[in-house]
């Protein structure tokens, strides 16, 4: 056959679906690779062809669209499973072609099983709720397009294994789950089961997401430098190791980039000749406030190094702060026989 633009295996779109549930999978060509949509392609006389390679096989084969009850079907640029089976796992290819044009892309589809508590190998989306911030909602994800608006589905919400029923601050409201006032105890996995009828059959969609309660923007502050501070003086003799920790607290801020850096005499450590190393560690609180520590280390400090200005800087979406470390050369202890004797006027 003639040449085909092959976009290869799009592993960025690792699609995971639950066994025994409907799944609708759009051909990625129109979403990520081509500059036109399916309708335009169809109008131009292009045909969309689907095929697949089973798990642990090399052989590409056509998809069987003649299964009982149309278990697998195609509608425009969507491949439908009603429902999926475990052995549908494999690499799927959609190819758009006519006599003069051809473009194709493959993507992996994994059909996974869930246990009695909805646990599975499925990668879960994370939804962050602000602590004690008033009413916040999560919405049952990825259920659009499965049933027409005329169909009224039944939605059941669970936290972990348990149906959300008479919970204090969590209220199911159809496709939404409302948190009246989010607390740390609300952290966990939440599952919605959407049940809908279609052609005399009942289908279930199961969607699980992780809720993480994080610091509220109401409580957010600019970075706070705990160290260096005015109470600690780094007093060293030449030849000793100089270690100065810069410890900064950052309030949780959605999509904020937290930065900590040192300057030595106003320059970044990389831009000066002294042998300095910086090690960073990061820890998080339960509400994802962050504490970053950068330890500036000079193995064998010189008297010149001890005259330099060491400043710790920190920046977040809330602002920028800086604090200088108090560094000084240690005055050597007097040698008794010489200095003290001289002091007493001994000859």
């Amino acid at each position: 056959s003639e040449r085909c633009d092959d976009w290869g295996l799009d592993t960025m779109r690792q699609i995971q679906v639950f066994e025994d549930e409907p799944a609708r999978i759009k051909c990625p060509l129109f979403e990520h690779f081509l500059k036109f949509n399916y309708s335009t392609a169809h109008s131009a006389g292009l045909t969309l062809i689907w095929y697949w390679t089973r798990q642990d096989r090399d052989l590409e084969e056509p998809i069987n669209f003649r299964l009982p009850e149309n278990r697998i079907s195609k509608e425009k640029d969507v491949l439908w499973f009603r429902p999926t089976l475990l052995n549908d796992t494999g690499n799927y290819t959609c190819m758009l072609r006519n006599t003069t044009y051809c473009s194709k892309v493959a993507f992996p589809l994994e059909v996974v099983q869930k246990d009695s508590c909805f646990n599975s190998p499925m990668k879960l989306p994370v939804h962050k709720l602000y602590i004690e911030y008033g009413i916040q909602r999560i919405t049952c994800p990825n259920v659009d397009g499965y049933f027409p608006s005329s169909v009224k589905p039944t939605i059941t919400w669970y936290m972990g294994c348990y149906k959300i029923q008479n919970f204090n601050n969590v209220i199911p409201e159809g496709m939404n789950l409302s948190f009246l006032i989010a607390l740390i105890s609300n952290n966990g996995n939440y599952t919605c089961v959407v049940t809908y009828p279609e052609n005399g059959r009942t289908f279930h969609l199961t969607r699980t997401l992780t809720v993480k309660v994080v610091g509220s923007p109401k409580n957010a502050v600019p970075p706070v430098i705990h160290s260096p501070n005015d109470h600690v003086v780094y007093e060293k003799e030449p030849g000793e190791e100089l270690l100065i920790p810069c410890t900064v607290y950052f309030s949780f801020l959605m999509d904020s980039r937290n930065e900590v850096w040192w300057t030595i005499d106003g320059k970044k450590p990389d831009d000066i000749t002294i042998d300095v190393t910086i090690n960073e560690s990061i820890s998080h609180s339960r509400t994802e406030d962050e504490t970053r520590t950068q330890i500036l280390s000079i193995k064998k400090v010189t008297s010149e190094d001890l005259k330099r200005s060491y400043v710790c800087h920190a920046r977040s979406a809330k602002g920028e702060v800086a604090k200088a470390a108090k560094v000084k050369q240690k005055v050597p202890a007097p040698r008794y026989t010489v200095e003290l004797a001289c002091g007493f006027g001994a000859t």
Epitope: E19, D20, P83, L85, Q113, K114, D115, S116, C117, F118, T154, T156, Y158, K163, Q165, N166, P172, V193, T195, T202, H204, T206
Partner: antibody, heavy 119, light 107 residues
Framework: QVQLQQPGAELVRPGSSVKLSCKAS????????MDWVKQRPGQGLEWIGN????????HYNQKFKDKATLTIDKSSSTAYMQLSSLTSEDSAVYYC????????????WGQGTSVTVSS | DIQMTQSPSSLSASLGERVSLTCRAS??????LSWLQQKPDGTIKRLIY???TLDSGVPKRFSGSRSGSDYSLTISSLESEDFADYYC?????????FGGGTKLEIK
């Protein structure tokens, strides 16, 4: 279509045990919980408990905790309920039914097995 | 355990008549309620789930509704095959519990 097949009847001696079966077909057995329900002659329905075939997780009605044991054979898509230390109080029809995580209750029922405890 | 009080326990009605059965929940069950029909041969079939959603294949003369803690099954026009026992079931919390049942007899 969904079918839950149960034997019609079992005659058992007092003090003995009986293992009732429920063979499922027409759906993915491991995706649905299997429930068991008791009905004494001329009486109403009582929920005994349920089991999830995929990992054998169970919920029991406290009333039946020491009476019933639920198990699964995935290879034959069959659910079992063992009833122990049988007395005349255990004479009843026992139904199996499937449910999806308790989201919409029990949607398909077996025909029931009539258990008679008699010496 | 949640108690489901079903009324009436028995009901005589004529063909074509409209009848309603009621279940009252002792605690909040948030529409986690279904209605079951049991025929004289013991066969059990679900009619309604989520308080008001009709199962596929169930005639439209059956309907379910809720008013406070009272849940109702209404048959708008009785047909001969409707004469059977009816049970409500709450599946809000374990253990799941049934109403005592209503025997619907032909007058």
């Amino acid at each position: 279509q969904v079918q839950l097949q149960q034997p019609g009847a079992e005659l058992v001696r007092p003090g003995s045990s009986v293992k009732l079966s429920c063979k499922a077909s027409g759906y993915t057995f491991t995706s649905y919980w299997m429930d068991w329900v008791k009905q004494r002659p001329g009486q109403g329905l009582e929920w005994i408990g349920n089991i999830y075939p995929s990992d054998s997780a169970t919920h029991y009605n406290q009333k039946f905790k020491d009476k019933a044991t639920l198990t699964i054979d995935k290879s034959s898509s069959t659910a079992y309920m063992q009833l122990s230390s049988l007395t005349s109080e255990d004479s009843a029809v026992y139904y199996c039914a499937r449910d999806y995580y308790g989201s919409i209750g029990m949607d398909s029922w077996g025909q029931g097995t009539s258990v008679t405890v008699s010496s | 355990d949640i108690q489901m009080t079903q009324s009436p326990s028995s009901l005589s009605a004529s063909l074509g008549e409209r009848v309603s059965l009621t279940c009252r929940a002792s605690q909040e069950i948030s529409d986690y309620l279904s209605w079951l029909q049991q025929k004289p041969d013991g066969t059990i079939k679900r009619l309604i789930y989520a308080a008001s959603t009709l199962d596929s294949g169930v005639p439209k003369r059956f309907s379910g509704s809720r008013s406070g803690s009272d849940y109702s099954l209404t048959i708008s026009s009785l047909e001969s095959e409707d004469f059977a026992d009816y049970y409500c079931l709450q599946y809000a919390s374990f253990p799941w519990t049934f109403g005592g049942g209503t025997k619907l007899e032909i007058k």
